[in-house]
């Protein structure tokens, strides 16, 4: 009803038409720079009522020093110079990550007002005469089902039960215990271990992509950019989680294998078949030896049954195989397998899911590998609570079923997950995690231990800050007598003094007024929020504390609710935005109902196709009908009737 929809998951986007030739030239200059970390790439554009002044530099943190790309029987030291990370100049706490290919930026930009995603326009719109080359949309405009179906996106309980039993059958290989571990002074050894494990916080990944993933994204660069953005997204989530005292867990890509369309006919490519079920697909990944990696994933573009978006082996502290650092071993079916594996797909119910969806899917599946089963119990599934105060924050990352993705908890781990993951990390991370990198002076971002950061000598135009080529003890420090550096924020002049009180440092947005310098810091102070309940996002939402976050219901003192099928409610209403009086679910009714006529004037606001509906029992189709999901559908029953499990196993192989 509102906005400019891009596809069935994205309800509003804007086009970008900045000069691609200019950005391509800047990228080439950055690529030729003497040091591979010494040149900023700048990109300026206006969208969504605000200015984006991106300053990015090559991202070397995501790929290990011995990073390799394998493709069609060739192993290459691949050039990752098109992968960039950075921030919005002058916006503290902002972050951007993506790639520049043929002069176009693709990736995500985190701002105070939420995350924006930038993608090539032709991925969604086939019209060649478009006046723009890229699309940009806000995370709030993604109607994100996250998990569809009975267990939403991550296979149902019976699949995990089968997998759990199989994990118990691994045969440990006898290995020589290192001599030092026989030492008598046990406590000393434990103390030593604990101090070294403090730095071992990086999980190295092997990512493979199948020919269908390549077919969708089109080039090696685009595929690597996708991998990079997925890894960066989970890196952000895990780094900011405290796993019972274990902090700063990060991820790094050690190796990539890209199966191109040429590999579709290659008999040695296990992922070449078009119609592989999700369990079989994971098994094919697991049949390879992944001992050199913390985790090994395959990315695909397949539409698995029941809306499954991913699958992974669940880690355990002991007594069972699977998850992080697991080595290849023999199992009950006589096969050697690596269970430090998982898979994700970027397609669901015939539509490509937005990057945010697959980023969180990836975080969810890696959560399994790290030892978290699906959340259960009242403490860890607040979205199912009868207590509306708890319910409104939604469910956590490891929730098994449909999730809207816009609630406070959707991007966090529950206490249940944290308890499980911390036990597995305690036991297993010493087996394969590596030490991570430190803050980098010269990357243009003021990090811990730095006073300022204006980059390397050939790019530092700052009279206020010692550049990164200066000796230790001086580099990234303010020059004597200088008050500040522009690298610290937009409220510092080129003359190294704080800007005066009245100067503007940030444009206003839907929900926040312009930022004004305060005269005593280089940072742009937080903008004053516009009044709560100001309409935003084309009237579909309202501003709450400066963020376009609340439901339109809140504007009228109501709460959003799920129109569930009961007391003669018409099925079509299951796909309407519904509101209720606070703490009174009996008043839940469509925005287009008689009851809420005073507020919405008969205007029905509908959910986007693919949104969870009927209290997470199904999802809305393109005709705004709530399709209930039958976990044990007719096809599954037919299979069971025709084949015995053993016979079906053989056929599947």
């Amino acid at each position: 009803q509102y906005g400019n929809p891009l596809n069935k998951y994205i309800r509003h986007y804007e086009g970008l038409s900045y000069n691609v030739d200019s950005l391509h030239q800047k990228h080439q200059r950055a690529k030729r720079a003497v040091s591979h970390e010494d040149q900023f790439l700048r990109l300026d554009f206006h969208a969504h009522g605000r200015h984006f002044n991106l300053r990015m530099k090559r991202d070397t943190s995501l790929f290990s020093d011995e990073f390799k790309v394998e493709t069609s029987n060739k192993v290459l030291d691949y050039d990752t110079s098109h992968i960039y990370t950075g921030h919005i100049y002058g916006e503290e706490g902002s972050f951007s990550h993506g790639s520049v290919i043929d002069g176009r930026f693709e990736g995500f930009i985190q701002t105070r007002g939420g995350t924006f995603y930038v993608e090539p326009a032709e991925r969604y719109i086939k019209d060649r005469t478009l006046p723009f080359h890229s699309v940009i949309y806000h995370e709030d405009d993604i109607n994100y089902p996250h998990k569809y179906g009975p267990q939403g996106g991550c296979a149902d309980h019976s699949v995990f039960e089968r997998m759990r039993k199989y994990q118990m059958t691994g045969v440990e290989e006898v290995t020589q215990i290192p001599q030092e571990e026989h030492a008598a002074n046990g406590p000393e050894l434990l103390r030593k271990k604990r101090t070294t494990s403090a730095e071992k916080n990086t999980c190295q990944l092997y990512i493979q992509t199948d020919h269908l993933f390549f077919k969708y994204y089109g080039t090696r660069e685009a595929v690597i950019a996708q991998i990079s953005s997925h890894v960066k997204a989970i890196d952000t989530i895990y780094q900011t989680t405290d796993f019972s005292g274990i902090r700063n867990i990060s991820f790094m890509v050690k190796r990539i294998r890209i199966n191109t369309t040429a590999d579709e006919k290659d008999p040695t490519n296990p992922f070449r078949f078009p119609n592989i079920g999700v369990e079989k697909f994971l098994e094919l990944n697991s049949e390879q030896n992944h001992d050199d990696y913390c985790l090994a994933y395959v990315f695909t573009d397949r539409d698995f049954d029941d809306g499954v978006l991913g699958l992974a082996w669940v880690g355990a502290p002991s007594g069972s195989s699977g998850g992080i650092c697991e080595k290849s071993k023999l199992y009950s079916d006589g096969k050697k397998k690596s269970l430090n594996t998982g898979i994700i797909t970027v397609q669901n119910y015939g539509s490509h899911v937005p990057p945010k969806v697959s980023h969180i899917t990836f975080a969810h599946e890696v959560g399994h590998n790290f030892g978290s089963p699906h959340d259960s119990g009242t403490e860890c599934t607040p979205g199912e609570s009868k207590n509306l105060g708890q319910k409104e924050n939604g469910n956590y990352i490891m929730y098994a079923r449909a999730t809207s993705g816009d609630k406070l908890n959707n991007n966090k781990f529950s206490l249940c997950s944290i308890r499980n993951i911390s036990q597995v990390l305690e036991k297993k991370r010493n087996n394969c995690f590596v030490e991570s990198g430190q803050p980098i002076c010269g990357n243009g971002m003021v990090e811990q231990g730095e006073e300022c950061d204006c980059g390397y000598s050939d790019q530092c135009k700052d009279e206020c800050c010692f550049d990164a080529n200066q000796p230790e003890g001086r580099k990234c420090k303010l020059k004597p007598g200088k008050q500040c550096s522009p690298s610290q924020g937009p409220c510092c002049t080129a003359q190294c003094a704080f800007k005066s009180k009245s100067e503007k440092c940030r444009d206003d947005s839907d929900c926040a007024r312009e930022g004004i310098c305060n005269g005593f810091t280089a940072l742009c102070p937080a903008s004053d929020p516009k009044p709560n309940f100001t309409d935003c996002n084309r009237h579909t939402q309202v501003c709450i504390n400066g963020q376009c976050a609340g439901s339109i219901c809140e504007k009228y003192g109501l709460e959003e609710c799920t129109c569930a099928s009961s007391d003669g409610k018409d099925d079509k209403e299951l796909c309407h935005v519904c509101c209720m009086k606070k703490m009174d679910p009996s008043t839940c009714a469509s925005t287009g109902s008689v009851q809420w006529s005073r507020h919405f004037s008969g205007r029905t606001i509908t959910l986007q196709p693919g949104s969870p509906c009927n209290d997470f029992r199904g999802y809305c189709d393109v005709f705004m009908r709530c399709r209930l999901v039958d976990a044990d559908g007719p096809l599954a029953r037919l299979k069971k009737a025709i084949f015995s499990p053993e016979l079906y196993e053989n056929i599947a192989e």
Partner: nanobody
Framework: EVQLVESGGGLVQAGGSLRLSCAAS????????MGWFRQAPGKEREFVAF????????DYADSVKGRFAISRDNVKNTLYLQMSSLKPDDTAVYYC?????????????WGQGTQVTVSS
Amino acid sequence: EVQLVESGGGLVQAGGSLRLSCAASERIFSTYFMGWFRQAPGKEREFVAFISGNGGSTDYADSVKGRFAISRDNVKNTLYLQMSSLKPDDTAVYYCAVAGRQIKSTWDYWGQGTQVTVSS
């Protein structure tokens, strides 16, 4: 398919009165909620009043309370809006609509509208 036809609109002086009618094509109308909405040029549609199937329950927008009265004649299949003490702000296209039997039903059928202009 329910057809709704509004009539009774026109030009009136501020402080004057008008009576709008909405004729429904089918008899099912007698048990259903009915309502009036209006839309002024350049503005969003705005709720005016609704009435339940038996006429026992009504509600009005604050801006028209005490000046407008909604009623229905289930024998004639007609909905009415008696408007008095009209103001220039009441200038708009007035639409009638039909919902289901319950207060939670949605407004599913709409008329084409009748223009009301109040001059000062």
